[in-house]
Interface confidence: medium
């Protein structure tokens, strides 16, 4: 025997109190698949969360974060505050990247500058808190006669300066 509830489409639930009639989901609830015996409560985007998509009878609301924050986790389950480029978020708030590290985004951690010498290259542009170094041609390519480009002074090795 086929379950009569399997005929209930998304946006409805199989109401056991009414002889398994398909009843529409009540306000502020939804069912995204057919054959449901209950409707799920819609997510509410409160506080730092903003509504990106309203709840409907067949799909949950979707949230994003208010300006100055960004989403974390599946379905934007959390909001995390932005920092400026050249900073990372710590327990003490936004802190500048240590010398030798950079962050070119408003989120995430400071990462070490690229070590150009590992690839046999020279530093073309020094790194900053906001930008990685730019590696240039290898020193061999800059030997007399090979090029007229004068290599810039190499950047200091990555290290941690006190904050």
């Amino acid at each position: 025997l086929q379950d009569p509830c399997s005929n209930c489409p998304a946006g409805t639930f199989c109401d056991n109190n009414r002889n398994q009639i398909c009843s529409p989901c009540p306000p502020n609830s939804f069912s995204s698949a057919g054959g449901q015996r209950t409707c799920d409560i819609c997510r509410q985007c409160k506080g730092v969360f903003r509504t990106r998509k309203e709840c409907s009878s067949t799909s949950n609301a979707e949230c994003d974060c208010t300006p100055g924050f960004h989403c974390l986790g599946a379905g934007c389950s959390m909001c995390e505050q932005d920092c400026k480029q050249g900073q990372e978020l710590t327990k003490k708030g936004c802190k500048d990247c240590c010398f030798g590290t950079f962050n070119d985004q408003k989120r995430g951690i400071c990462r070490p500058w690229t070590n150009c010498s590992l690839d046999g290259k020279s530093v073309l542009v020094n790194g900053t808190k906001e930008r990685d170094v730019v590696c240039g041609p290898s020193p061999a390519d800059l030997s007399p006669g090979a090029s007229s480009v004068t290599p810039p002074a190499p950047a200091r090795e990555p290290g941690h300066s006190p904050q």
């Epitope: 506080g47 974390l72 389950s77 959390m78 909001c79 995390e80 505050q81 710590t90 327990k91």
Partner: nanobody, 123 residues
Framework: EVQLVESGGGLVQPGGSLRLSCAAS????????MIWYRQAPGEELEWVAN????????YYVDSVKGRFTISRDNATNSLFLQMNSLRAEDTAVYYC????????????????WGQGTTVTVSS
């Protein structure tokens, strides 16, 4: 239901004091970092202070250091913000928020917020 409810806001003169409270319910309060944020009229939300699970770590935005004190009482599921030497620029809606539980990589994310309490500093 997971809930945070702030109270204690009001109108105060410059140099005055207020103590904000945040009552938590519906989750194991002592497992989470807790955070105070504020939003001045027309401005973005600003982090004010945070406190770890047992109250041994506390951090503040530079503009409130030495004037504001964050604390918590895990026995009563309560978070507090003692605000002294208040200034006009402290006028804002103050929100408490639940932070990370220390076991996830979303350590600095917030997922539960209160409705806010308004602090007005004016003579």
């Amino acid at each position: 239901e997971v809930q945070l409810v702030e109270s204690g806001g009001g109108l105060v003169q410059p140099g005055g004091s207020l103590r904000l409270s945040c009552a938590a319910s519906g989750f194991t309060f002592s497992n989470y970092w807790m955070i105070w944020y504020r939003q001045a009229p027309g401005e973005e939300l600003e982090w004010v202070a945070n406190i770890n699970q047992d109250g041994s770590e506390k951090y503040y935005v530079d503009s409130v250091k030495g004037r504001f004190t964050i604390s918590r009482d895990n026995a009563t599921n309560s978070l507090f913000l003692q605000m002294n030497s208040l200034r006009a620029e402290d006028t804002a809606v103050y929100y408490c928020a639940r932070g990370g539980d220390g076991y996830s990589n979303s350590h600095y994310g917030m997922d539960v917020w209160g409705q806010g309490t308004t602090v007005t500093v004016s003579s």
